[in-house]
């Protein structure tokens, strides 16, 4: 198994993957296979109302660049806790002995996996990205080497511009074949999106490819600068009883997903008032309604908040509210 894979993002469309060769390979490592797939955002993000008081905005950070060649495990790999980044303590004698035993066990276990679990598979020629990856069959052996990925379904908002749920994980996943090096720059990725990366070491560069159990690591690309900005005008409609319906377009390709909108409005000469519009409320009304407005000139600005933070405020939109008791009843309904 390739050791200590670390992945970092250096831009909104790239992830850099680095690893170390297996400690005790079976024969010569001829190449590595790197597969990646986009991860759906947690389904609770689509359901929770982040406008509720006391509900903290979800913390989603991208994978920061390397500090040095040896700063391993910047971002969590599967089953790791991401609670904090700490230095490793000096190893005790018992730990060193234990690691030597584990190294010996790993060698034996890899031999076992090679011979018992995996059936060698053929890969088609040509560029990896076009290869639909002929199925690498596994013989059933309980849960050995079996990693399950829970992909949340986004049932509540099927039509909003959010991260889509990937189709069957084994099908048509992009991959790269890496020869003579222990690093890869994965390009052409979506901004501020989590990716699950699978890395295998292979020791036979023939149609009967023999590859190790996969090592897994996760990373998130960096945010795109203006992706959370509301594009297009903020429009309004004035209804009876001085109700103003404000409407705007959801950012087309936000950083992750939009969790809420802030609406800031003020009557000329008065202090600014704020409304928080959740995903659900926006979806229901395509905006929000201001009710009980006193007559006068108003300005309104709106900004979106995504998993990566706030977008920019829109340019102010202006509207005038009349004293509806004094006007004929032909105001737009």
């Amino acid at each position: 198994v390739p050791l200590d894979p670390i992945s970092v993002s250096n831009s909104s469309s790239q992830i850099i993957l680095k690893w170390k060769p297996p400690s005790d390979p079976n024969g010569n490592i001829t190449h590595y296979l790197v597969f990646w797939e986009r991860q759906a955002e947690d389904s609770e993000l689509f359901e929770l109302d982040y406008c509720l008081k006391g509900l903290k905005l979800p913390s989603r950070t991208w994978s920061p660049p390397f500090e040095s060649e040896d700063s391993q495990k910047h971002n969590q790999s599967e089953y790791e806790d991401s609670a904090g980044e700490c230095c490793s303590c000096p190893k005790t004698d018992s730990q060193i002995l234990k690691e030597l035993e584990e190294s010996s066990f790993r060698k034996t276990f890899e031999d076992y996996l090679h011979n018992v679990v995996f059936v060698p598979r053929k890969t088609s020629s040509g560029t990896g990205a076009e290869d639909p990856r002929p199925s690498r069959k596994r013989r059933s052996l309980g849960d050995v080497g079996n990693v399950t990925v829970a992909v949340p379904t986004v049932a509540a908002f099927p039509n909003t511009s959010s991260t889509s749920v990937p189709t069957s994980p084994e099908e048509h996943r992009p991959f790269e074949k890496v020869v003579n090096k222990e690093s890869l720059v994965i390009s052409g990725l979506r901004h501020f999106t989590g990716y699950r990366i699978e890395l295998q070491a292979c020791n036979q560069d023939t149609p009967e490819e023999r590859c190790s159990v996969a090592a897994y690591v996760s990373a998130r690309t960096m945010p795109e600068a203006k992706a959370d900005d509301i594009v297009g005008p903020v429009t309004h409609e004035i209804f009876e009883n001085n109700v103003v319906h404000l409407m705007w377009q959801e950012p087309k390709e936000p950083n992750g997903l939009i969790v809420l909108y802030e609406v800031s409005y003020r009557r000329y000469g008065d202090e600014e008032l704020h409304l928080c519009v959740s995903r659900k409320h926006f979806a229901l009304e395509r905006g929000c309604r201001l009710r009980g407005l006193s007559p006068g000139n108003y300005s309104v600005r709106i900004r979106a908040t995504s998993l990566a933070g706030n977008g920019s405020w829109t340019e102010p939109t202006y509207f005038y509210v009349t004293d509806y008791l004094d006007v004929p009843s032909n105001i737009a309904k």
């Epitope: 982040y50 406008c51 509720l52 509900l55 704020h274 928080c276 979806a283 009304e285 395509r286 309904k333």
Partner: antibody, heavy 118, light 112 residues
């Protein structure tokens, strides 16, 4: 003048289906989310379902999830509630109501009575 | 879901006298933007519900000034300064802060 008129209620046996309609007039129907709210005999009000202005987003009360379907036809200014697998506890007056975010429901229909009985 | 509890459930009042209905929520109704989405509805006998008050204390158009709403957080009150015959019916509080919207059980106001 805003008007909401429900139709389609009646007496139906348990397990059967019924479709309610709500005809809207006097406002731009396609700009508003719409709700169904029900009231069992002698009881309080219970929210049933809501549909967004375009019809693409729908939410249901747990008590009707999987059995009831809310839909709308903006070209006909009409809201619908398809009720399947009806139970005795679905017996109620069903109101359609216009949505105002946070402020609840600013206009209600007169209601249509659904009685589920064998 | 947020539970709304009203009291009293029955309120006999003499014409011209004041009346007060209490509504308590199981969670705070203050939204992140500091607005409180608590509404009051009136349902006269044989009629549909009608909204009287929105956002705790704002009267809907056409609602007589004898109706007033107050409160904050989890405790709210609807007051009628002088009850008139046309006020007979059931009054419901409803919260619009948390999803789904939920109603109180209703308070039946009747004339003594």
């Amino acid at each position: 003048e805003v008007q909401l008129v429900e139709t389609g209620g009646g007496v139906v046996q348990p397990g059967r289906s019924l479709r309610l309609s709500c005809a809207a007039s006097g406002f731009t129907f396609s700009s508003y989310a719409m709700h169904w709210v029900r009231q069992a005999p002698g009881k309080g009000l219970e929210w049933v379902a809501v549909i967004s202005y375009s019809g693409s987003n729908k939410y249901y009360a747990d008590s009707v999830k999987g059995r009831f379907t809310i839909s709308r036809d903006n070209s006909k200014n009409t809201l619908y509630l398809q009720m399947n697998s009806l139970r005795a506890e679905d017996t109620a007056v069903y109101y359609c109501a216009r949505h105002e975010w946070g402020f609840g429901f600013d206009y209600w229909g007169q209601g249509t009575t659904v009685t589920v009985s064998s | 879901d947020v539970v709304m509890t009203q009291s009293p459930l029955s309120l006999p009042v003499t014409l011209g006298q004041p009346a007060s209905i209490s509504c308590r929520s199981s969670e705070s109704l203050v939204y992140g933007d500091e607005n409180t989405y608590l509404n009051w509805f009136q349902q006269r006998p044989g009629q549909s519900p009608r909204r009287l008050i929105y956002k705790v204390s704002n009267r809907d158009s056409g609602v007589p000034s004898r109706f007033s709403g107050s409160g904050s957080g989890t405790d709210f009150t609807l007051k009628i300064s002088r009850v008139e015959a046309e006020d007979v019916g059931v009054y419901y509080c409803m919260q619009g802060t948390h999803w789904p919207y939920t109603f109180g059980q209703g308070t039946k106001l009747e004339i003594k």
